[in-house]
């Protein structure tokens, strides 16, 4: 009888099924959808999380479509193909043989095509801009306090190395969090900025992926910071390839 058997849960991913019957009596927590035994000491990849979300019972699924003015991720949810390490495959296709290329956060970066479409490599999203609007407060937050609190949040809750939080901008009521992480900067074991941004996005929508933790309770010097709108912009190391007709 081991400690693993007493506490066989996955703190970082509630979309798992856990059992204490792994090798040597270890706890194993398998992600819904993919069935992969995930690492519960860190964030699960966005690709495996989307796969789990799409495998959940339909009555438990809420299709959240981003604001029509956001030029990102406005295709909604899809059931992704993940590579052998849980990352998005560069080419994604649906059941009707419509295919498209995605970046490392799974956002479409080309026009849709057919099965002949080629996506030569998975292009890395190296810069993420999280644009928030907070609910009205008595006064503006102190910028340095806000900066410190958001950096603490990404470090402690999402386990993102502080060097990847490039900046926090604030012009009441808009907050912008810049995450930057080049391929060369990301070491083995580092949380990916795309995964951290996805966990944050789900947190602010009140759909936390963490097991048994309360929702996000953001406070700046005791004052609640309540987010009323979120937009996330993704910048890739190689610019996306959309035809001109999409821009008109």
């Amino acid at each position: 009888h081991t400690a693993a058997q007493d506490n066989c849960t996955c703190p970082t991913n509630k979309m798992t099924v856990c059992s204490p019957d792994g090798p040597g009596g270890r706890c194993q927590c398998r992600a819904l959808g993919s069935g992969v035994a995930v690492d519960c000491s860190t964030l699960t990849s966005k690709c495996l999380l989307l796969k789990a979300r799409m495998s959940a019972p339909k009555n438990a699924r809420t299709l959240v479509r981003p604001n029509e003015h956001a030029l990102v991720d406005n295709d909604g949810l899809y059931d992704p193909d993940c590579d052998p390490e849980g990352r998005f495959k560069a080419r994604q296709c649906n059941q009707t043989s419509v295919c498209w290329c995605v970046n490392s956060v799974g956002v479409r970066r080309t026009d849709k095509g057919d099965l002949s479409l080629r996506c030569d490599e998975l292009v890395r999203t190296h810069h993420i801009l999280i644009d928030l609007r907070h609910r009205p407060t008595a006064g503006a937050f102190n910028h340095s306090d806000l900066d410190a609190e958001l950096r603490r949040l990404f470090r402690e809750r999402y386990r993102l190395h502080p060097k990847f939080v490039a900046a926090v901008h604030y012009e009441q009521p808009t907050i912008q969090i810049e995450l930057r992480q080049n391929t060369s900067q990301k070491a083995a074991g580092d949380v990916d900025i795309g995964d951290a941004a996805y966990y944050f996005e789900r947190d602010v929508k009140g759909e936390s992926l963490f097991q048994g933790r309360g929702g996000l309770d953001l406070r700046v010097r005791g004052e609640p910071l309540q987010v009323e709108r979120t937009l996330i912009y993704y910048l890739d190391e190689i610019p996306p390839k959309f035809s001109m007709k999409r821009l008109t």
């Epitope: 400690a3 693993a4 792994g22 270890r26 706890c27 992969v36 035994a37 519960c40 390490e85």
Partner: nanobody
Amino acid sequence: QVQLQESGGGMVHPGGSLRLSCAASGFTFSGSDMSWVRQAPGKGPEWVSYITSGGTTYYPDSVKGRFTISRDNAKNTLYLQMNSLTPDDTALYRCAKARLTDSHYVEDAWGQGTQVTVSS
């Protein structure tokens, strides 16, 4: 990029044997723990064997004494020898780059799998 390619699956009669292989590339195979995981139709995945980089092996009770996991580090290949097969062993078998933490079993990468069908 990690790649794991299984082979050796097929149809076999109850009581028969099969040997599965998994060719690994894109990582230091000799320094990695590996496992075999199977998924039967309509059931969840279950690990059926585990081998550490040093050669220590683990098996669940369901296959103990019938299955043997081994590795050839010179060939970057993982094996699973399966004897005394029963219809309950029918499943998709995939190999995984895995590890054990203090409390958890984790799969860091996995193959597409090879189908094993045991039927009379």
